[in-house]
């Protein structure tokens, strides 16, 4: 249960800017790039680079654009119909199971293992045992430390790849 991180919205932004385009809702909904007015009569456009909506909606205000964290690069900017796309910087990755921050990729595999997968923005390097071909799981000491581990003893648990 603690893994479920949620975010409540901040106070709605004021939407009275005269330059915002308006159109009529369709079946009570507004198209991507718009939100609905409080009286439900108008669709008001989102502000480019500030907020967005990606689907037909009855939102009273558009959603705030994501700002990329330090350690991330912006792949594509926020538009009125699409949120910012951020990606971990080269040499770092973000796992689905621990998505809060970009983590540094390992620089090499432990003794007795070979690298079969490179560091990507969404995955660490992948190591397998030379002989058995089983995949390495869990934390791995730095390459320098693995040299000192006992022969035949893996530095951390291994599991069958599947």
């Amino acid at each position: 249960e603690s893994a479920l991180i949620t975010q409540q919205d901040l106070a709605p932004q004021q939407r009275a800017a005269p330059q915002q385009k308006r159109s009529s809702p369709s079946e009570g909904l507004c198209p991507p790039g718009h939100h609905i007015s409080e009286d439900g009569r108008d669709c008001i456009s989102c502000k480019y680079g500030q907020d967005y909506s990606t689907h037909w909606n009855d939102l009273l205000f558009c959603l705030r654009c994501t700002r990329c964290d330090s350690g991330e690069v912006e792949l594509s900017p926020c538009t009125t119909t699409r949120n910012t796309v951020c990606q971990c910087e080269e040499g770092t990755f973000r796992e689905e199971d621990s998505p809060e921050m970009c983590r540094k990729c390992r620089t090499g595999c432990p003794r007795g293992m070979v690298k079969v997968g490179d560091c990507t923005p969404w995955s660490d390097i992948e190591c397998v045992h030379k002989e058995s071909g089983t995949k390495h799981s869990g934390e791995v000491p730095a390459v320098e430390e693995t040299v000192t581990s006992s022969p035949g003893t893996p530095a951390s648990p291994c599991s069958l790849s599947g």
Epitope: T6, Q7, D58, L59, L63, R64
Partner: nanobody, 125 residues
Framework: EVQLLESGGGLVQPGGSLRLSCAAS????????VGWFRQAPGKEREFVSA????????YYADSVKGRFTISRDNSKNTLYLQMNSLRAEDTAVYYC???????????????????WGQGTLVTVS
């Protein structure tokens, strides 16, 4: 542990209606956006609708716009999907889902969701 249990599916004639429910056993349900997805036989799971944490405002897929309505009751930790004017192409297993992280106010892609129910089958025939 996060548990989501869908109900309300069944067999319905074209043009008919169904109301799906999703009961959540997680204390943070009332502070999280939540969504409905569906998966037809042989097809990928697709977004149907998602609703804000406070129930004020929702997203709808083009294919269900004007026919489906999402709602929630945070006091009961329950999500609903009212489906009207059902069509044969709405036949699918319907899943409710909670996002895995809180960086999006209203997630609408499968990868943004990490907690899934077992699904309830809706057959329109």
């Amino acid at each position: 542990e996060v548990q989501l249990l869908e109900s309300g599916g069944g067999l319905v004639q074209p043009g008919g209606s169904l109301r799906l429910s999703c009961a959540a056993s997680v204390s943070t349900f009332g502070t999280s956006p939540v969504g409905w997805f569906r998966q037809a036989p042989g097809k990928e799971r697709e977004f149907v609708s998602a609703i804000r944490w406070d129930g004020v405002g929702a997203y709808y897929a083009d294919s269900v716009k004007g026919r489906f309505t999402i709602s929630r009751d945070n006091s009961k930790n329950t999500l609903y999907l009212q489906m009207n004017s059902l069509r044969a192409e709405d036949t699918a297993v319907y899943y409710c889902a909670l996002p895995r992280r809180g960086d999006s106010e209203l997630p609408s892609t499968v990868k943004e969701y990490g907690y899934w129910g077992q699904g309830t089958l809706v057959t329109v025939s």
